[in-house]
Interface confidence: low
């Protein structure tokens, strides 16, 4: 670490005195301190001197000598006062700069340590300091204002209490700059625009931040507009809007629209899409398929998109039968809006009842007509069996009748013994029936089909079984030929 | 004083090649679209060329597409027009010209600030 | 791409009122600008937006459009109003700038 003799903190001459402050290191040094006149630098290897014959005010301050070689940076200082009866304060600088909530130093140093007890700081013209102002005092360096705000930006002075009067230093002039976290905000409304032809329309680009120093354009596809800026302030922000109003919107006013905003921190830019349209339009559409098949009991949720132009006049859902009246319930229906254009309309079918089969049909309307979109709704079921013994053309036959959706397959299974259903250990034949006869098949409704197995004798000790399943379960039949009549089973899901 | 200069102008022989400079200053040459228009001697006014004020968008009147190209350079406050393929009928004072794009009640589009034009002949 | 026709010139004794026309299809619905230029001289603007007056020009300009005609009126007419007057609009569907043929104002000595 260098050393400066006279090796004291603090020096204090009168002006006009010969002031010679030597360093020495173990390598070459250097010396700094505040810009002022008179000084002379003598260097000779590992000393350096700096000296004067006319000591000034102005060279108070404080000296450091620092050794450019020393890899721990060591370094020392003395600080010297000038004192002068006429010039208490040394100003260094008449400007300071600094952001929002970060300390300013004033640097207005005393020439004369006896003062220290008489200083304040004071804005110009003697007005008091701002109340809130937070600030201390250091001989050696000035004022310092604490966590300065930007109402603070003010001109200042330095009073110190000289023989009973306060004496001023000159002006500095304090700006606190405010923090920019980043570029404007902005905002473009709307987000999406429609409009007919010949209609009026408005679209607002506006910007904010906490600095005045920013631009703002709002550009259609690669056209800068030249717009009326509005230009305000609150809430500690300032405000620039662009509001584009046309009042009869053609083709050419369609496209992308993207609001620009700058400052030094960067650029923010968002854009929206305006579509000019011949006349009002009413687009129904469903991701989901309109035929719908659905268990018995279980629930659904019927959904439709809309896009329209002017917005819905009317809405609703509607139930087309074939099976009651019933319509469905409001509370069941709910729409949700994506955004101004486009919505979702969803209809929620609980636990659905065998008469809530059939179509269901949403109509929408507005100034450009009414849309329906119909749903086709179909419930499935597991099949139930039923068989009975008959003659047919004068031959034994068991008839078997399943009835289900979708249509059921049939089995039938013959084995030993009586059983209310066979398994495979008792199976002594079986018998696929490929085509079923279809008794009926109406829209909405289950399918029934019948298959005919004819048997010349019934064997007493054995049991004719129909199977019947589909995608939804399997339902059976076991006919046991006593007097008593036929087990049945009831169908599995 | 805001001021467009002009300059590159000269005489060529049909099917040669030019290329003219337009300097601004004195305004924000990056707020404006800007044009090149053309006047042949004794005859009325030709608009020529624009480009949007970021270089985006370019467009040309039916007699040079193809032939010419519109370009900027933001940076240097210029804008530039090369003309290849010269004909006879190209001959024309042309002048470059700051082009104001307003949306205010109805989109338009007019040219504001005019150079002084620089004169092209094209001659065998 | 629709033209605009204006009278190759129009003759006005200094002090009264000269009006130039601009005539083209439906222009009403476009916005009409006027420029001045006197010889060897640029263009300059006088007239945009149909009716606004650059700074600098005198209120003596004025402008109007409906229907299929736009009209420069200068009133008050001077002596150094003398010059060739153009109309122009701007072509949505090319997106080109379009020029009236232009009118010789002659101010009467």
């Known amino acids: 670490i260098p050393v400066i003799e006279p090796s004291v903190p603090e020096l204090v001459v009168k002006p006009g005195a010969t002031v010679t402050l030597r360093c020495v290191g173990n390598g070459s040094v250097e010396w700094d301190g505040p810009p002022s006149p008179h000084w002379t630098l003598y260097s000779d290897g590992s000393s350096s001197i700096l000296s004067t014959n006319n000591a000034t005010f102005q060279n108070t301050g404080t000296y450091r000598c620092t050794e450019p070689g020393d890899p721990l940076g060591g370094s020392a200082a003395i600080h010297l006062y000038v004192k002068d009866p006429a010039r208490p304060w040394n100003v260094l600088a008449q400007e300071v700069v600094v952001f929002e909530d970060q300390d300013a130093l004033l640097p207005c140093l005393l020439t004369d340590p006896v003062l220290e007890a008489g200083v304040s700081l004071v804005r110009v013209r003697g007005r008091p300091l701002m109340r809130h102002t937070n600030y201390s005092f250091s001989p050696w360096h000035g004022f310092t204002i604490h966590r300065a705000k930007f109402i603070q930006s003010q001109d200042y002075q330095c009073s110190a209490l000289m023989g009973g009067r306060k004496v001023m230093s000159i002006s500095i002039r304090l700006k606190v700059q405010k923090v920019i976290p980043g570029p404007p905000a902005l905002t473009l409304v709307p987000a999406e625009l429609v409009r007919i032809r010949g209609e009026a329309a408005q679209i607002v680009c506006s910007a904010s931040s906490v600095d005045v120093n920013f631009d703002v354009f709002l550009q259609h596809n690669n056209t800068k507009l030249a717009i009326p800026q509005q230009s305000d302030f609150h809430n500690n922000r300032y405000q620039k809007v662009l509001t584009l109003n046309l009042d009869q919107v053609d083709f050419q006013h369609a496209g992308n629209y993207s609001c620009v905003a700058s400052n030094v921190q960067g650029k923010h830019s968002t854009s929206m899409f305006f579509r000019v349209v011949e006349s009002a339009y009413l687009n129904l559409s469903s991701e989901q398929n309109l035929i719908q098949e659905v268990t018995v009991g279980e629930g659904l949720n019927l959904k439709v998109m809309v896009e329209a132009y002017p917005g819905l006049q009317g809405f609703n859902w509607t139930y087309l039968g074939p099976f009651s009246d019933h319509q469905p319930e409001p509370k069941l229906a709910n729409a949700t809006t994506k955004d101004t254009y486009r919505h979702t309309f969803t209809l929620s079918l609980p636990r659905l009842k065998p008469s809530e089969a059939g179509r269901y049909s949403f109509l929408a309307r507005n100034p450009g007509g009414w849309r329906a979109l119909t749903f086709e709704l179909t419930l499935r079921y597991p099949p139930e069996v039923s068989v009975i013994w008959t003659f047919i053309n004068g031959s034994g036959t068991l008839l078997c009748a399943a009835s289900g959706y979708p249509q059921p397959n049939v089995t039938w299974l013959q084995c030993s013994g009586h059983t209310d259903r066979c398994d495979e250990a008792q199976v002594l034949q079986v018998w696929d029936d490929p085509y079923p006869e279809v008794l009926s098949q109406e829209p909405f409704h289950k399918v029934t089909v019948q298959s005919l197995l004819t048997v010349e004798t019934l064997e007493h000790n054995q049991t004719y079984e129909c199977r019947a399943h589909n995608s939804v379960g399997s339902g059976s039949w076991a006919f046991i030929p006593i007097s008593a009549g036929a087990h049945t089973h009831p169908p599995d899901e | 004083q805001v001021q467009l200069v002009e300059s590159g102008g000269g005489l060529v022989r049909p099917g040669g090649s030019l290329r003219l400079s337009c300097a601004a200053s004195e305004f924000t040459f990056d707020d404006y679209a800007m044009s090149w228009v053309r006047q042949a001697p004794g005859k009325g006014l030709e608009w020529v060329s624009a480009i949007s004020w970021n270089g985006g968008s370019t467009n040309y009147a039916d007699s040079v597409k193809g032939r010419f190209t519109i370009s900027r350079d933001n940076a240097k406050n210029s804008l530039y027009l090369q003309m290849n393929s010269l004909r006879a009928e190209d001959t024309a004072l042309y002048y470059c010209?700051?082009?104001?794009?307003?949306?205010?009640?109805?989109?338009?589009?007019?040219?504001?600030?005019w150079g002084q034009g620089t004169l092209v002949t094209v001659s065998s | 791409q629709a033209g605009l026709t204006q009278p190759p010139s129009v003759s006005v004794a200094p002090g009264q009122t000269a009006r130039i026309t601009c005539g083209g299809n439906n222009i009403g619905s476009k916005s009409v600008h006027w420029y001045q230029q006197k010889p060897g001289q640029a263009p300059v603007l006088v007239v945009y937006g149909d009716s606004d007056r650059p700074s600098g020009i005198p209120e003596r300009f004025s402008g109007s459009n409906s229907g299929n005609t736009a009209t420069l009126t200068i009133s008050r007419v001077e002596a150094g109003d003398e010059a060739d007057y153009y109309c122009?609009?701007?072509?949505?569907?090319?997106?080109?700038?379009?020029f009236g043929g232009g009118t010789q104002l002659t101010v009467l000595r």
């Open positions: 122009q609009v701007w072509d949505i569907s090319s997106d080109h700038v379009v």
């Open positions: 010209a700051s082009t104001v794009e307003v949306a205010h009640r109805r989109l338009y589009k007019y040219l504001e600030v």
